[in-house]
Amino acid sequence: HTDLSGKVFVFPRESVTDHVNLITPLEKPLQNFTLCFRAYSDLSRAYSLFSYNTQGRDNELLVYKERVGEYSLYIGRHKVTSKVIEKFPAPVHICVSWESSSGIAEFWINGTPLVKKGLRQGYFVEAQPKIVLGQEQDSYGGKFDRSQSFVGEIGDLYMWDSVLPPENILSAYQGTPLPANILDWQALNYEIRGYVIIKPLVWV
């Protein structure tokens, strides 16, 4: 694994090929999670930020930007969207959490919580995922669509199997995240596929 502290994945072009596979040995279904990362893009169209598919299950967990100021979370192919007033283009720190028991999903944008939404109460997110940055999967690890590809930079990505309390979300935003047990930017197992470059993080 690699410590990517102070670095980002740069996706320099629109494509149907360029992506990063994130590798985790996640063995049991997710009842809760929190995902945090930083992103910087000047795309005004829709694009995938984080695509998690399992065998035979598309959009098992997907973080998707619909347009400026609109972020969507898919859980088990169901979707909620939260709105925020944001500058464009501008760097953003995104956290999203979901709790199976209540179905509550919550986005935090730059340390500020958006309106909570609910979906898939009682559902468990399947384990053994293929996780892709830079493209939106329509199959298990593939079937990409250029029009949903990400162009820009992504870094500081952490994923926990719990709903983090607000103070820990703020810690992640401020650059001092808790150790993460699904994906940890400081100890990341990944595979670069295509034209993706690792560069210093210069926009925080």
């Epitope: 410590d3 040995p25 199997d161 047990n181 940890d184 400081q186 100890a187």
Partner: antibody, heavy 119, light 107 residues
Framework: QVQLVQSGAEVKKPGSSVKVSCKAS????????MHWVRQAPGQGLEWIGM????????NYNEKFKSRATITADKSTSTAYMELSSLRSEDTAVYYC????????????WGQGTLVTVSS | DIQMTQSPSSLSASVGDRVTITCKAS??????VAWYQQKPGKAPKLLIY???YRYSGVPSRFSGSGSGTDFTLTISSLQPEDFATYYC?????????FGQGTKLEIK
């Protein structure tokens, strides 16, 4: 096989410093966080801090932040932990331990280095 | 810092016995707990990670359970080589912290 071999026992005077080494073999040294943990005689385990040898990023237990310095030499696959301003309470066995592949647990440990602080 | 409190601190048992050691965290640590075994003069060895997963090569008589604040290590049928000190550890928050240990002795 994966192995961590530490330097030998040390006897130090109060106020002095000690530098313990940990040589890694059998795996890619630059790909794993290395942690340091200590154990006072008859006591439990206490986490000191950690280093990623490739990025040289470190993280310390606040308790040791002002006195401990963790470094790594990629060319020799060796991690070091230096503790300064030693006092008698620092008498302990110091262990290096490798972080597991995917989780923040320690799957490989050095044999330990006894540091005795005595006047 | 998160305190990890183990109980009992020592325990006498016989070969073949079922033994349970508990660890209580001072705050929620989710499932981010490991158990280690340590024998005198030796380094600790990882037994259980993520509260309930046996580490590679660890005998099936060792099992772990729990989440949140309460965790358990169970040895289903004690073997002579199991007499040692056992430690729990949380890695949910920095600094990582350990329990004070449970010494398992032969009755």
């Amino acid at each position: 096989q994966v192995q961590l071999v530490q330097s030998g026992a040390e006897v130090k005077k109060p106020g002095s410093s000690v530098k313990v080494s940990c040589k890694a073999s059998g795996y890619t040294f630059t790909s794993y966080w290395m942690h340091w943990v200590r154990q006072a005689p008859g006591q439990g385990l206490e986490w000191i801090g950690m280093i990623h040898p490739n990025s040289v990023n470190t993280n310390y237990n606040e308790k040791f932040k002002s006195r401990a310095t963790i470094t790594a030499d990629k060319s020799t696959s060796t991690a070091y932990m230096e503790l300064s301003s030693l006092r008698s309470e620092d008498t302990a066995v110091y262990y290096c331990a490798r972080r597991n592949d995917y989780y923040w647990y320690f799957d490989v440990w050095g044999q330990g280095t006894l540091v005795t602080v005595s006047s | 810092d998160i305190q990890m409190t183990q109980s009992p601190s020592s325990l006498s048992a016989s070969v073949g016995d079922r033994v349970t050691i508990t660890c209580k965290a001072s705050q929620n640590v989710n499932s981010n707990v490991a158990w280690y075994q340590q024998k005198p003069g030796k380094a600790p060895k990882l037994l259980i990670y993520s509260a309930s997963y046996r580490y590679s090569g660890v005998p099936s008589r060792f099992s772990g359970s729990g989440s949140g604040t309460d965790f358990t290590l169970t040895i289903s049928s004690l073997q002579p080589e199991d007499f040692a000190t056992y430690y729990c550890q949380q890695c949910n928050n920095y600094p990582f912290t350990f329990g004070q240990g449970t010494k398992l002795e032969i009755k």
